[in-house]
Interface confidence: low
Amino acid sequence: ANSLLEETKQGNLERECIEELCNKEEAREVFENDPETDYFYPKYLVCLRSFQTGLFTAARQSTNAYPDLRSCVNAIPDQCSPLPCNEDGYMSCKDGKASFTCTCKPGWQGEKCEFDINECKDPSNINGGCSQICDNTPGSYHCSCKNGFVMLSNKKDCKDVDECSLKPSICGTAVCKNIPGDFECECPEGYRYNLKSKSCEDIDECSENMCAQLCVNYPGGYTCYCDGKKGFKLAQDQKSCEVVSVCLPLNLDTKYELLYLAEQFAGVVLYLKFRLPEISRFSAEFDFRTYDSEGVILYAESIDHSAWLLIALRGGKIEVQLKNEHTSKITTGGDVINNGLWNMVSVEELEHSISIKIAKEAVMDINKPGPLFKPENGLLETKVYFAGFPRKVESELIKPINPRLDGCIRSWNLMKQGASGIKEIIQEKQNKHCLVTVEKGSYYPGSGIAQFHIDYNNVSSAEGWHVNVTLNIRPSTGTGVMLALVSGNNTVPFAVSLVDSTSEKSQDILLSVENTVIYRIQALSLCSDQQSHLEFRVNRNNLELSTPLKIETISHEDLQRQLAVLDKAMKAKVATYLGGLPDVPFSATPVNAFYNGCMEVNINGVQLDLDEAISKHNDIRAHSCPSVWKKTKNS
């Protein structure tokens, strides 16, 4: 249909403007649109000036590209004549309404295909797909290689020239190591290469008292160790020991008026017994602060354990479970209150219901047919447990709950009896005092560890097992073991540790297999009031890491051997420890100090909740972290 239209237009042009002269209006009737008419008519007048000598000035045939008026006029509507495209770069030219479209050859761009594409800078094909050097050329590009490499047949990748194979005796009895573009004569650690004899000579490091605390000698080397669990670390000289110093002081101020609910990893923090007149009803008022999402705030029961009430937190909301001779109920309601703010909570037994209020606003009203606890002999006897419940209760709950709750309460008033007697108990016991200010996170005080049982086997993967670790850390000391996998034979097949860096005010992260550092991330400023995000991915073939500064896949000659050691351990059973090491020999790892600071850990996509640990040191805080100590003008 388009070609028929073009032929019609061409015929009209012939009749109207070549066989006869046409004015602009007549030309408009030929083209039937303004852009083409406005483009055509001035050029038509130029053709007339050139060929219609009788009408205009004499034609200068010598300067005209066309032999006659017909050719000159017929060429006007063709935007591709004369060719507007760059001859080197164009593939075809398409005529349009008072416009043209140049289709470019590969390697060219621009309206007229006048610009060479720099394939070497193409973001979608980095470095033009060349493994080493990319050289851009007009309309094309080619790859080349650095010294010591040769180009492969695919013309993109470079292969290293193996000098060690070309000259087998180049290093004598030492090992010739081919490196990209060069070679090296290598000796095992603890030996040095002798150029004259072309051999490796042993270095005897441990013949003198090299180490301050403990020296372990082995063929080709030695290692000094310090007792990290007593707060020592190896000094920069790798021989003497120094105290692990605080790099980020924390505000560890506590108040005895604030009761810490997570004093015990397993067990009740406070137990009270009330004997009140039979007209009394259950009542509890307190201010409550936590970042924890699940756990027991308080549990109350009758003396004979026939009736009980549980006030807990689940999903950050208040949950009430109750059971007595009349009813068995579970209710959750109100807003999420694990926001780290002080929330006023009251639970009051009314005549026909139990009212739960947050900030004096009713959030739940639980109907009950009769009294919650039945009086006996004119007395209402009630036992109240803070932050836990007796062991036997666990199986009786309507819905199971993890009782551990990292939180604080203050301004409590139980059974309308005020705080009498309780403050006196708490005042004497430092462990029951809560920190004045806390932030979200988990806190490791540098004195203990948490243990988890995690199955790293991935049956759906060819790798067989994998360890994907994400750490969000805010250390307070620059040295300590953050995460360790420990085998049954007291070896540590994998550990992630922090050490103070040789460069001032920065830290290195060590990845180790047994007592060998397989990778060191150097000079990161981790001791700041901002959290740092670290990621590690390990399987039997690869080790990848991501830090605030870089993402990389680690590969070095010894790595596969170390990963094989790790692979063997992972096929047996390993225990996962956070914050330090259990009782393993000093020489089991490069670092043995406890980690001190805030840390949140995600392993294989699961955020580890310290409340779910197999065991945890009581001083580790599962869901609260002390604030950074701010210097005031007076201090």
Epitope: R314, G315, G316, K317, I330, T331, T332, G333, V336, I398, K399, P400
Partner: antibody, heavy 122, light 107 residues
Framework: EVQLLESGGGLVQPGGSLRLSCAAS????????MSWVRQAPGKGLEWVSA????????YYADSVKGLFTISRDNSKNTLYLQMNSLRAEDTAVYYC???????????????WGQGTLVTVST | EIVMTQSPATLSVFPGERATLSCRAS??????LAWHQQKLGQAPRLLLY???TRATGIPARFSGSGSGTEFTLAISSLQSEDFAVYYC?????????FGGGTKVGIK
């Protein structure tokens, strides 16, 4: 008695879309998480998707991730399931189900609608 | 995901007799297990939750037991209205999963 009434099912060609609705009544709709569960002809029950009481959190079975979208309008007491790029294997009766617990966590389903049949076929 | 396996697939019982249905989880679901009953052409109906708690209006002849990975639904004396398909459902972790069902038929 809680009432859940599904609608929007029907015959659709492979690659097509449907939007299911579930009208809820006789309970405090905005306090409960809701789910969609489906049952292919002659087969068992398969959980498809869930949405929190406020609608801020959504969960999907791997088989429908990226293809189905669950949503709710608490002002209209209505639950929705937008199904795109439908395949023959999505042919099933789709039930909407009420979460037993109120508040922000998820449990079993204490009430089910009568279901609406979705047939994906040429 | 947690795989729920029900056995037997079909159970033929005389009216008035006891029926015992089994449900096994591929990993622990604690007590977070529900049982649903579905009659032909009808929507499912909740029977038990928390492994052993009867839902509102469910007769005492239905009882549940078990925790962790092994669960049992028992119907002490089968009535004509009990012949249906029974499904177990775990609600311990995403995605929620159902067993393949046990069809209880008249012998």
């Amino acid at each position: 008695e809680v009432q859940l009434l599904e609608s929007g099912g029907g015959l659709v060609q492979p690659g097509g879309s449907l939007r299911l609705s579930c009208a809820a009544s006789r309970f405090s709709f905005s306090s409960y998480a809701m789910s969609w569960v489906r049952q292919a002809p002659g087969k068992g029950l398969e959980w498809v998707s869930a949405i929190s009481d406020s609608g801020s959190n959504t969960y999907y079975a791997d088989s429908v991730k990226g293809l189905f979208t669950i949503s709710r309008d608490n002002s209209k007491n209505t639950l929705y399931l937008q199904m795109n790029s439908l395949r023959a294997e999505d042919t099933a009766v789709y039930y909407c189900a009420k979460n037993y617990e109120s508040g922000g966590y998820y449990t079993f389903f204490d009430y089910w609608g009568q279901g609406t049949l979705v047939t994906v076929s040429t | 995901e947690i795989v729920m396996t029900q056995s037997p697939a079909t159970l033929s019982v005389f009216p008035g007799e006891r029926a015992t249905l089994s449900c096994r989880a591929s990993q622990s679901v604690r007590s977070n297990l529900a049982w649903h009953q579905q009659k032909l052409g009808q929507a499912p109906r909740l029977l038990l939750y928390g492994a052993s708690t009867r839902a509102t209006g469910i007769p005492a002849r239905f009882s549940g037991s078990g925790s962790g990975t092994e669960f049992t639904l028992a119907i002490s004396s089968l009535q004509s209205e009990d012949f249906a398909v029974y499904y177990c459902q775990q609600y311990n972790s995403w995605p929620f999963t159902f067993g393949g069902g046990t069809k209880v038929g008249i012998k």
